[in-house]
Interface confidence: medium
């Protein structure tokens, strides 16, 4: 039950995280005009990964896409790449994790297969989250660098008579969305990896099977399950993991965490 909950929660947290990464990538407010030195500006500038926008005092907002690919800063291209890689990995991870969910039955899929898929999706979520966090952090670092550079030469003018205020940019909402979303995806991935440990059997080749015949107990040591000849009401097939043959009375009848639900 705990495994299912951990896996399910990991999936949901990762889903929210990836949705957040997609939202952050699409948002226009990666950097917003710093109004500290010019709070009375009637024109508000903000920029995203794909376009820059200007909101005017009239309420009119104009956005222009970055229609060049080669003319863009390498850092911006790197951030775009990191975010896209994060989204792609996250999307694949989600797809894999859907099939890995313990609560979903697909044919006669083994627990070991589900465990592997859970681990795979978990790793994908972790890498996806790291990509998003890295992308946002690179952009934030770029902003900080540019902010202090523009502060150094903020006011230029003709003999101090005319002021030209250089527009400075600060952290936009998308950065915080990206950081939180990346963190959630990372946490979701870790949860999936933890769930994988609970799903994986300690040893996958079953050495013995004990079954209760109608009359007396006989232990067999076959390679796998053998059909029983007796069909009494107390007949059970049990998996014995630690080698030796035992009678039915010696085996606990409580369901193991490795039993199929």
């Amino acid at each position: 039950m705990a495994v299912t909950a951990c896996q399910g929660l990991g999936f949901v947290v990762s889903l929210i995280g990836i949705a957040g990464i997609i939202a952050a990538t699409c948002m226009d407010q990666w950097s917003t005009q710093d109004l500290y030195n010019n709070p009375v500006t009637a024109v508000f500038n903000y920029q995203g990964l794909w376009r820059s926008c200007v909101r005017e005092s009239s309420g009119f907002t104009e956005c222009r896409g970055y229609f060049t690919l080669l003319g863009l800063p390498a850092m911006l291209q790197a951030v775009r790449a990191l975010m896209i890689v994060g989204i792609v990995l996250g999307a694949i991870g989600l797809l894999v994790s859907i099939f890995a969910l313990k609560c979903i039955r697909i044919g006669s899929m083994e627990d070991s297969a589900k465990a592997n898929m859970t681990l795979t999706s978990g790793i994908m979520f972790i890498v996806s989250g790291l990509c998003a966090i890295a992308g946002v952090s690179v952009f934030a670092n770029m902003l900080v660098t540019n902010f202090w550079m523009s502060t150094a030469n903020m006011y230029t003018g003709m003999g101090g008579m005319v002021q030209t205020v250089q527009t400075r940019y600060t952290f936009g909402a998308a950065l915080f969305v990206g950081w939180v979303a990346g963190g959630l995806t990372l946490i979701g991935g870790v949860m999936m990896c933890i769930a994988c440990r609970g799903l994986a059997p300690e040893e996958t080749n079953y050495k013995a099977v004990s079954y209760h015949a109608s009359g007396h107990s006989v232990a067999y040591k076959p390679g796998g399950f053998k059909a029983s000849t007796g069909f009494g009401s107390n007949t059970k097939n049990k998996k014995i993991y630690d080698g030796g043959a035992r009678t039915e009375d010696e085996v606990q009848s409580y369901p193991s965490k490795h039993d199929y639900v």
């Epitope: 500006t41 009637a42 820059s52 005092s57 222009r64």
Partner: antibody
Framework: QVQLVQSGAEVKKPGASVKLSCKAS????????MHWVRQRPGQGLEWIGM????????NYNEKFKSKATLTVDKSTSTAYMELSSLRSEDTAVYYC????????????WGQGTTVTVSS | DIVMTQSPSSLSVSVGDRVTMTCKSS????????????LTWYQQKPGQPPKLLIY???TRESGVPDRFSGSGSGTDFTLTISSVQPEDFATYYC?????????FGGGTKLEIK
């Protein structure tokens, strides 16, 4: 078509208050900022402030902050400007304007309201 | 506040003349985000509200004759009427649309010679 119809001329005594109205029609009133501009006799134009009918948020010229109060009534699509503690220098024509350009929607002004402050 | 200075304060011209009036701002009206200058030109005739002619320093409002043109960037702007018509005699105002409070120039009155 878009229309901004302002209230009639007002004659007030010094120290009194006056509330001017600007009724909008022909567009979605709550979507555009409403500006107020003053023009003294034979003088230039002065921006008083603006109000967004949807949120009620305002932006005043510091010079008029203690003089003018901007409000709206969404139900009647009407913008109001109340002028308090009137003095002779407040004698002017007051315009309301829906200023929005840069798209298909142009700039519209009311016909103006003349306020005369005289003892 | 941004101070807008218009010159000349009045101008006497004949119909058909080419007219140029200037407007200077105490601070740049150029927005680096979209490389637009937030300067507006208005025409006002006696007893009428102002009429928008040009915004973003050089973009003509729809319905405004093409004899009106705006130019300039940063702090220096110009309104040109290529061939003055009788209906153009009015007062012209420039306005800072970049920073609160929005401020107007003192106006340039275009008179018949």
């Amino acid at each position: 078509q878009v229309q901004l119809v302002q209230s009639g001329a007002e004659v007030k005594k010094p120290g009194a208050s006056v509330k001017l109205s600007c009724k909008a029609s022909g567009y979605t009133f709550t979507s555009y900022w409403m500006h107020w501009v003053r023009q003294r006799p034979g003088q230039g134009l002065e921006w008083i402030g603006m109000i967004h009918p949807n949120s009620g948020s305002t932006n005043y010229n510091e010079k008029f902050k203690s003089k003018a109060t901007l409000t709206v009534d969404k139900s009647t699509s009407t913008a109001y400007m109340e002028l308090s503690s009137l003095r002779s220098e407040d004698t002017a024509v007051y315009y309301c304007a829906r200023r929005y350009y840069g798209s298909i929607s142009p700039d519209y002004w009311g016909q103006g309201t003349t306020v005369t402050v005289s003892s | 506040d941004i101070v807008m200075t218009q010159s000349p304060s009045s101008l006497s011209v004949s119909v058909g003349d080419r007219v140029t009036m200037t407007c200077k701002s105490s601070q740049s009206l150029l927005n680096s985000g979209n490389q637009k200058n937030y300067l507006t030109w208005y025409q006002q005739k006696p007893g009428q509200p102002p009429k928008l002619l040009i915004y973003w320093a050089s973009t003509r409002e729809s319905g405004v004759p093409d004899r009106f043109s705006g130019s300039g960037s940063g702090t220096d702007f110009t309104l040109t009427i290529s061939s003055v018509q009788p209906e153009d005699f009015a007062t012209y105002y420039c306005q800072n649309d970049y920073s609160y409070p929005f401020t107007f120039g003192g106006g340039t009155k275009l008179e018949i010679k």
